[in-house]
Interface confidence: low
């Protein structure tokens, strides 16, 4: 059976914490990704941004987990209306921003 959304979000947060804490060299070799609007559709938007990073084992599990929250199929190069136009940030910063936002959602009980 699927895990409850609260558990899934908790697992995603734990994975992001793990990434930030275990970061030694620049995450994903300093790859840049599109910054996203965190106020709506965060899971699909985050996946649409991170899926463009390939060959980075550190975020593969995160990519798979985000995939579970997004109902539609996401492929590399897909444009998201939720991205912050023409603004790119390092994956490490993206993960930190996402982590802060998801922790807030979890505290507020917004698991969906």
């Amino acid at each position: 059976s699927p895990v409850p959304p609260s558990t899934a979000l908790k697992e995603l947060i734990e994975e992001l914490v793990n990434i930030t804490q275990n970061q030694k060299a620049p995450l994903c070799n300093g790859s840049m990704v599109w910054s996203i609007n965190l106020t709506a559709g965060v899971y699909c938007a985050a996946l649409e941004s991170l899926i463009n990073v390939s060959g980075c084992s550190a975020i593969e599990k995160t990519q798979r987990m985000l995939n579970g929250f997004c109902p539609h199929k996401v492929s590399a190069g897909q444009f998201s209306s939720l991205r912050v136009r023409d603004t790119k940030i390092e994956v490490a910063q993206f993960v930190k921003d996402l982590l802060v936002h998801l922790k807030k959602l979890f505290r507020e009980g917004q698991f969906n």
């Epitope: 059976s1 699927p2 895990v3 409850p4 959304p5 609260s6 899934a8 559709g41 899971y43 699909c44 995939n67 579970g68 929250f69 997004c70 109902p71 539609h72 199929k73 698991f111 969906n112």
Partner: antibody, heavy 123, light 107 residues
Framework: EVQLLESGGGLVQPGGSLRLSCAAS????????MSWVRQAPGKGLEWVSA????????YYADSVKGRFTISRDNSKNTLYLQMNSLRAEDTAVYYC????????????????WGQGTTVTVSS | SYELTQPPSVSVSPGQTASITCSGD??????AYWFQQKPGQSPVLVIY???KRPSGIPERFSGSNSGDTATLTISGTQAMDEADYYC?????????FGTGTKVTVLG
């Protein structure tokens, strides 16, 4: 253990009504979307309707739109399907399904099915 | 309305590979799901998200999806795999099931 138990099926005349119920147990019912899927005798599967989890959205197949209404009572862990203006072609086994629809779920798809309840529409 | 087309039947010898196709317009842009249904039983999800197996589903079941076709492959088919198989996708706020394929294990 996750379980879905359908009830309410039976024999009804064309134009009549029935209300199907699905009692859920073993999971946090309110967190999940639920669907009804039917299967006519000797035929394939046909999705009928879905009710999203926290989102409160409802969805219907064109074949039942305007005649069937899906609802849920999270306090009773129960999903319902109100079927009005029934036709012979609505004769089928109706399955209650724990769903993976939409942005409200950790989306695995329809991985828990009830045993089904039989609806027969005949005069 | 969106349609998913499957071959009515597929026959396979024990131990061989059975492939079931599911065709739909730009199906590769959607997630494909596969269900197994044995006579008198409720359907069972065997593949979700094109190629992922739920826990408890044997490794011999695999899936792929690209272009207009999703494929369910059963490697080393066993007698217990004889069943009806249905593909499924989500399109325009409705679920769509395929027409179904009866897999017969010969012998």
């Amino acid at each position: 253990e996750v379980q879905l138990l359908e009830s309410g099926g039976g024999l009804v005349q064309p134009g009549g009504s029935l209300r199907l119920s699905c009692a859920a147990s073993g999971f946090t019912f309110s967190s999940y979307a639920m669907s009804w899927v039917r299967q006519a005798p000797g035929k394939g599967l046909e999705w009928v309707s879905a009710f999203s989890g926290s989102g409160g959205s409802t969805y219907y197949a064109d074949s039942v739109k305007g005649r069937f209404t899906i609802s849920r009572d999270n306090s009773k862990n129960t999903l319902y399907l109100q079927m009005n203006s029934l036709r012979a072609e609505d004769t089928a086994v109706y399955y209650c399904v724990q769903d993976g629809l939409g942005p409200y779920f950790y989306n695995y798809g329809m991985d828990v099915w009830g045993q089904g309840t039989t609806v027969t529409v005949s005069s | 309305s969106y349609e998913l087309t499957q071959p009515p039947s597929v026959s396979v010898s024990p131990g061989q590979t059975a492939s079931i196709t599911c065709s739909g317009d730009k199906l590769g842009d959607k997630y494909a799901y596969w269900f197994q249904q044995k006579p008198g039983q409720s359907p069972v999800l065997v593949i979700y998200h094109d190629s992922k197996r739920p826990s408890g589903i044997p490794e011999r079941f695999s899936g792929s999806n690209s272009g207009d076709t999703a494929t369910l492959t059963i490697s080393g088919t066993q007698a217990m795999d004889e069943a009806d198989y249905y593909c499924q996708a989500w399109d325009s706020s409705t679920y769509v099931f395929g027409t179904g394929t009866k897999v017969t294990v010969l012998g």
